[in-house]
């Protein structure tokens, strides 16, 4: 299921129109597309151009992150007169052109979405040959990937004075709320660091001091679901070691 956010000021689409009315480049992309991790999403992009009936060589490109300079994730090339845009690049094989560039459509399908795909994407078309021109969406389309929580790491670590602390890291979008439960804890939100810088979908919760032996459970929850994982602490009493 894919949701396309409606921008009321531009009625569904960001329309970038350039040049004089008689001959102009324009690109139409929605501000945002939402889809769930594991699913597929379609990034719509259509364009108009000033080169009437152009049928020369063309290249269609999608890049991620920033316009003009972001890394390419998809590229295809169509020979003069051909409607077939032959894929030259499809990052991890997950990107596929749905539209027909000859018909001014660069729409792209992204398969097997992951949280890492949550970024802005920019479509671009280049004409080569007699006509020599190019144009790229400057605003792009934000792909918003949602995901149920997943606990990526749970561990017990030594801390000063022969004590122990527990860490739980989960990912999800929206970022999940984390709670610890365990001996003499009840339900504790503990110390939550959320989200980690540079890891927008990761949330970490810490139990700074584990005072009792037993099972400690971390629960991650967001609007799409919940996940839990446990860790066990058993200390050899009278010794400085512990078994987890």
């Amino acid at each position: 299921f894919v949701r396309t956010k409606i921008d009321t000021t531009e009625n569904l689409l960001n329309t970038e129109v350039h040049s004089s009315p008689a001959q102009r480049w324009s690109m139409q992309v929605p501000p945002e597309v939402s889809a769930e991790a594991g699913d597929a999403a379609v990034l719509p992009c259509t364009f108009t151009h000033p080169h009437r009936h152009y049928d020369g060589p063309l290249t269609a490109i999608w890049r991620a992150g920033e316009p003009y300079a972001g890394p390419q994730v998809f590229r295809c090339a169509a020979a003069r007169g051909s409607e077939l845009c032959q894929t030259a690049l499809s990052l991890h094989g997950r990107f596929r052109l749905l539209g027909n560039p000859r018909r001014n459509d660069l729409s792209l399908r992204v398969e097997r979405l992951a949280l890492a795909d949550d970024r802005r994407y920019f479509c671009r078309v280049e004409f080569a040959g007699d006509v020599h021109d190019r144009y790229e969406s400057r605003h792009g389309v934000r792909l918003h990937v949602t995901a149920a929580p997943r606990i990526v790491n749970i561990s017990v670590l030594p801390s000063p004075a022969h004590a122990f602390r527990a860490l739980c890291t989960a990912e999800g979008e929206p970022p999940p709320a984390l709670a610890w439960s365990g001996p003499a804890l009840g339900n504790s939100l503990a110390a939550v660091r959320s989200p980690r810088e540079g890891h927008g979908h990761l949330v970490t919760a810490e139990l700074p001091a584990l005072t009792h032996d037993g099972r400690y459970t971390c629960t991650a929850a967001n609007s799409l679901g919940r996940s839990e994982a446990s860790v066990y602490l058993f200390r050899f009493h009278g010794a400085s070691g512990a078994s987890t």
Epitope: H18, Y68, A77, L89, H132, R134
Partner: antibody, heavy 118, light 112 residues
């Protein structure tokens, strides 16, 4: 770090051929157009040729059309310029450059001197 | 072909002073709003050219903010404030709007 390293040029007689190559590293080679730009001794910069991402489309300045061939090998990250029917006016330092379109000729090689003389 | 005309051909500047180089194109280099295909390069003596400014006014990576590009359509300016000894060399403007891609004839900057 982006690096472009041209092969050695040399002295060649008018009418003869020479092939230049340029080894690239530090970036995703196939994501960019590449170009050759030359500079005659004590003169300014002159664009020679450009090649598209997959080597399908080439552009040349009129004075080298039909004599020069630009090509690329994406598997080896190399750019080439085959120069045939060389003329004395082709004498120049040849630079390979990464052509970023909206970012200009963003990176340049160290240049290699080609002298066409009998 | 688009002709890029640079002025002056050379200029001599006192360290700490500012310098200004003009570039005029024979055709508008404005492709679409916010997208003008004009660039500035510096070639230091015995070295390869280096990109200074892209799309009129954007500073290339590692270029000090003493360099500033401005202009529109057909008239462009590179201004260097607080000129330093390391700024000597030949400055070129160039266009990537149309094939053949062309450069200005260069402006030689010297230090007094």
């Amino acid at each position: 770090e982006v690096q472009l390293v041209e092969s050695d040029g040399g002295l060649v007689q008018p009418g003869r051929s020479l092939k230049l190559s340029c080894a690239a590293s530090g970036f995703t080679f196939s994501d960019y157009y590449l170009a050759w730009v030359r500079q005659a001794p004590t003169k300014g910069l002159e664009w020679v040729a450009s090649v598209s991402y997959d080597g399908i489309t080439n552009y040349y300045r009129d004075s080298v059309k039909g004599r020069f061939t630009i090509s690329r090998d994406n598997a080896k990250s190399t750019l080439s310029l085959q120069m045939d029917s060389l003329r004395s006016e082709d004498t120049a330092t040849y630079y390979c450059a990464r052509q970023d379109w909206e970012g200009g000729f963003a990176y340049w090689g160290q240049g290699t001197l080609v002298t066409v003389s009998s | 072909d688009i002709v890029m005309t640079q002025t002056p051909l050379s200029l001599s500047v006192t360290p700490g002073a500012s310098a200004s180089i003009s570039c005029r194109s024979s055709k508008s280099l404005l492709h679409s709003p916010g997208l003008t295909y004009v660039f500035w390069y510096l070639q230091k003596p015995g070295r390869s050219p280096r990109l200074l400014i892209y799309r009129v006014s954007n500073l290339a990576s590692g270029v000090p903010d003493r360099f500033r590009g401005s202009g529109s359509e057909t008239d462009f300016t590179l201004k260097i404030s607080r000129v330093e000894a390391e700024d000597v060399g030949i400055y070129y403007c160039g266009q990537l709007l149309e094939n053949p891609f062309t450069f200005g004839s260069g402006t030689k900057l010297e230090i007094k």
